[in-house]
Amino acid sequence: APVPPGEDSKDVAAPHRQPLTSSERIDKQIRYILDGISALRKETCNKSNMCESSKEALAENNLNLPKMAEKDGCFQSGFNEETCLVKIITGLLEFEVYLEYLQNRFESSEEQARAVQMSTKVLIQFLQKKAKNLDAITTPDPTTNASLLTKLQAQNQWLQDMTTHLILRSFKEFLQSSLRALRQM
């Protein structure tokens, strides 16, 4: 798995380089996670025909994956920094159970799946430091998450492959929207 941001050999070799600002660190972290998702998607697409699945079939699912909407204040029109930051953190916290589900779903990219999960936890911590209104952030209920995970793991082989594909696609879209929004902050 690639080395997480801030831990590569270049950082060691160049000690007098300016330390990254909070925003730069967050930006770099998101791009690192997106690279990890690309690698996981590559394995998923090589293994099955899931990536050719129709948008209709993907839309017709029983998952409740976080998605950016106008009211979240993350789009250019109606942009609201505080509302948007709360949405990003809440969304990432909601994605955590799905990232846990992705573990033991990959053969050659097993470490990559773990790296995506761990890097997301770090990203959440970075963003929580940035947020002023932490009270507005709702943390998912662990019991609900546990039963959701059990239900997802009970699915048949095809459904699990589809679920994996959809989680990766949705997480990628969520992170890309987050990255655009955070660059405006």
Epitope: S53, A57, N104, F106, E107, W158, L159, M162
Partner: antibody
């Protein structure tokens, strides 16, 4: 042509053990989850166990009625799946089928001919 | 667990007529555009034979007179026209999630 064939059934005393084997052909075995299903006049058709892939750490799932007594395993190099049955009870009597489940609406499921397991004193 | 309730328990149909067997699931077996409901035919001394998978897809070598329909929780198997060879037990099965479950069966006979 997809084929699954069971073996290893027979007569066993209550509390005894037995190992069923299933060999598959006609498809890339290592790419598919595999299952055991059983049938008895008393309980009808009943799913018993499932084993997943290497990428899933060979995760297993069992029917409540066999949990802790039965163990499903696989050997991808031999295209085989096994069912180790311990502490057998009279109610475990039945025909045991090895099945390769379907995949979405692309591929259908395949069942073997079955092997009879009789648990009796 | 998803419970499957099959009806009727037995059915007698005249040759050439239509036989309809129903199967109701205790919760939806539908996801990503597919309903994971299968139908099997079983004759004495033989293993179950797959007739229909994913609610409406015909198994290989299955005659066109067998058809499946339904979505979500309510499904049916239709046999038309009924032939002598169709005398058998019929089972529905959900393969959406473990534990995979079966209906109690329907005994189909000729009237």
């Amino acid at each position: 042509e997809v084929k699954v064939e069971e073996s290893g059934g027979g007569l066993v005393q209550p509390g005894g053990s037995m190992k069923l084997s299933c060999v598959a052909s006609g498809f890339t075995f290592s790419n598919y989850w595999m299952n055991w299903v059983r049938q008895s006049p008393e309980k009808g058709l009943e799913w018993v166990a499932e084993i997943r892939l290497k990428s899933n750490n060979y995760a297993t799932h069992y029917a409540e009625s066999v949990k802790g007594r039965f163990t499903i395993s696989r050997d991808d190099s031999k295209s085989s799946v096994y069912l180790q049955m311990n502490n057998l009870r009279a109610e475990d009597t039945g025909i045991y089928y090895c099945t390769r489940p379907g995949y979405g609406n692309y591929e259908e499921a395949y069942w073997g001919q079955g092997t009879l397991v009789t648990v009796s004193a | 667990d998803i419970v499957l309730t099959q009806s009727p328990a037995s059915l007698a149909v005249s040759l050439g007529q239509r036989a309809t067997i129903s199967c109701r699931a205790s919760e939806s077996v539908h996801n990503f555009g597919i309903s994971f409901m299968n139908w099997f035919q079983q004759k004495p001394g033989q293993p179950p034979k797959l007739l229909i998978y994913a609610a409406s897809n015909q198994g290989s070598g299955v005659p066109a007179r067998f058809s499946g329909s339904g979505s979500g929780t309510d499904f049916s198997l239709n046999i038309h026209p009924m032939e002598e060879d169709d005398t058998a037990m019929y089972f529905c099965q959900q393969s959406k999630e473990v534990p995979y479950t079966f209906g109690g069966g329907t005994k189909l006979e000729i009237k």
